[in-house]
Interface confidence: low
Amino acid sequence: VPGEAEQPAPELVEVEVGSTALLKCGLSQSQGNLSHVDWFSVHKEKRTLIFRVRQGQGQSEPGEYEQRLSLQDRGATLALTQVTPQDERIFLCQGKRPRSQEYRIQLRVYKAPEEPNIQVNPLGIPVNSKEPEEVATCVGRNGYPIPQVIWYKNGRPLKEEKNRVHIQSSQTVESSGLYTLQSILKAQLVKEDKDAQFYCELNYRLPSGNHMKESREVTVPVFYPTEKVWLEVEPVGMLKEGDRVEIRCLADGNPPPHFSISKQNPSTREAEEETTNDNGVLVLEPARKEHSGRYECQGLDLDTMISLLSEPQELLVNYVSDVRVSPAAPERQEGSSLTLTCEAESSQDLEFQWLREETGQVLERGPVLQLHDLKREAGGGYRCVASVPSIPGLNRTQLVNVAIFGPPWMAFKERKVWVKENMVLNLSCEASGHPRPTISWNVNGTASEQDQDPQRVLSTLNVLVTPELLETGVECTASNDLGKNTSILFLELVNLTTLTPDSNTTTGLSTSTASPHTRANSTSTERKLPEPESRG
């Protein structure tokens, strides 16, 4: 019998856990009769008979393999089902005749581990630690044999590096015989690692070859001291009164420091802390010109009690002050002239416009509106608009009412009204003038007067149509200190032969006609805003 050392290497059979291993007895006919074979398992150099073949018939021996062995291929192959990690051993077949020969088979068992599970250190890592700190843990469950782990940072494999990178791996054997691998990556991190992507890779082998599985990528919280704090204002660009403005503190440290936002008191030059919301944001809503000023942010590291101050940031909330028109309530005689001057202050250059209130017509671009040879029609509203052209929506306006002295002026001189006898008639009469006139009627009825504007009045009369009324008609008389004027309403009975009233007659309220608004040549003068007083 040749010595052990001279035995040929066993045949290698590779299978996955749970599958069937086909153990083919490689004895040639000259080495032994395959109809008379004993199968052994060898574990720790101890042989255990597990199966007998006699006259081509197989018989399991009692024990761990009793239920899982069967003969195939006319008795030359022993099939082992439901392979487990514990089956990784040498199996040998031994022929009995003509001489005792044996053939060895090395069974190798494989099982792919589950997807690696990676857990980042939730407490994070300070950059100034003296030795490597735990970054993440990688667990690969139920693999066989033990898989190899490789750690990656930003796609590059990490290697052990004294005092910088340390990989600590351990494994446990499950009751199934499968391995669970746990690998802990410890490293000294720097600030730039705050965005680094870490993952682990498990390398393992199957009968089909080498394989690998990757975990998801994770980032680890990296703690580093704040070196700089700064202010950010939203929205960016020109701000105006009424805007919602948010001022927030930002820092380049992690965790960020405790923030406070201060505004310099313009009189004391002291920084006064502002009240921020729960997120540490100072919300100015609506922003006012008083919010303008110098803001700064203080970041206090609550661990070290080191305080950092941001660069101050000047905030300008642009505004237009109340618009002032002079004279405020002008009264003029017909034929005279009037100069209206508009004033306002702003943080930016202002543009002025004068509009006719009733029509919206632009009369002048500039702060001064000159009206010459005033007619009665020139009475009414004039609006000054002060706007900042560089900031859309930033404007203020002021309306001024121009009164032209004159006796009452009737909206109509006479009018025909179609009526039925015994109906209650609703008549109206409108007059304007300065001083504002009052209206009286020549018949009894229920009258009510409404002021339309400072120079215009509308009177409404409810009256019963009687034969006498039909005969006399109705007059309304408007009077003021400068005179009186009358409008006549002729009442006509509606009968079957009456034609449809033409466009010059009405059955309801009379309305005033639109008057043309004229203005003479006007010039505008340029006006400089007052300079702010300098500090003493």
Partner: antibody, heavy 117, light 107 residues
Framework: QVQLQESGPGLVKPSQTLSLTCTVS??????????WSWIRQHPGKGLEWIGY???????YYNPSLKSRVTISVDTSKNQFSLKLSSVTAADTAVYYC?????????WGQGTLVTVSS | EIVMTQSPATLSVSPGERATLSCRAS??????LAWYQQKPGQAPRLLIY???TRATGIPARFSGSGSGTEFTLTISSLQSEDFAVYYC?????????FGQGTKVEIK
């Protein structure tokens, strides 16, 4: 040129209230750039800052006098005032009003208030 | 409050000589410091603000320096009208506080 002028009684009895007014001319008290202060100087001694008022009415008083001091402003009259209650002989001093910014550039000429029965 | 300490209490100098007055703050006041001159029966007069900026109309012989806690007022060549009491005052914190004064007298 901004000018300040203190006015008020020169003699106040102990336990009473000292009242002084400062009238500002040549500039508006409502100019938001400055604050308006009261400062006093005990005979032969140094200067002691009493408190200030801003045109909007916000004030700050020296903690050592806070319980007894009230400063008020009347922008329509361009004046601000000092009231110091429960006075004693130790409150005898020359009282100045001044306009504050980066230091006090403009001062009143000062008024001597003696506390004596 | 911030305590301002001036030294010396009295400085005897001959006309034409240089005078150097010191002021120390108990904590930093940055450069928010003013110097005043006061003559008997008069209100103080602002000489220097911002630690080193001369107020309007103040002669060039007056100069200020320093920052933080240590400040100096220098009068390069004393004139007869410069003999007076000089005060420093901080305006970095409330309450505003003055030094106790340095009297510059004729030697």
């Amino acid at each position: 040129q901004v000018q300040l002028q203190e006015s008020g009684p020169g003699l106040v009895k102990p336990s009473q209230t000292l009242s002084l007014t400062c009238t500002v001319s040549g500039g508006s008290i409502s100019s938001g750039t400055y604050h308006w202060s009261w400062i006093r100087q005990h005979p032969g001694k140094g200067l002691e800052w009493i408190g200030y008022i801003y045109y909007s009415g916000s004030t700050y008083y020296n903690p050592s006098l806070k319980s007894r001091v009230t400063i008020s402003v009347d922008t329509s009259k361009n004046q601000f005032s000092l009231k110091l209650s429960s006075v004693t002989a130790a409150d005898t001093a020359v009282y100045y009003c001044a306009r504050g910014g980066d230091g006090y550039k403009y001062w009143g000429q000062g008024t001597l208030v003696t506390v004596s029965s | 409050e911030i305590v301002m300490t001036q030294s010396p209490a009295t400085l005897s100098v001959s006309p034409g000589e240089r005078a150097t007055l010191s002021c120390r703050a108990s904590q930093s006041v940055s450069n928010n410091l003013a110097w005043y001159q006061q003559k008997p029966g008069q209100a103080p007069r602002l000489l220097i603000y911002g630690a080193s900026t001369r107020a309007t109309g103040i002669p060039a012989r007056f100069s200020g320096s320093g920052s933080g806690t240590e400040f100096t007022l220098t009068i390069s060549s004393l004139q007869s009208e410069d003999f007076a009491v000089y005060y420093c005052q901080q305006y970095n914190n409330w309450p505003r506080t003055f030094g106790q004064g340095t009297k510059v007298e004729i030697k």
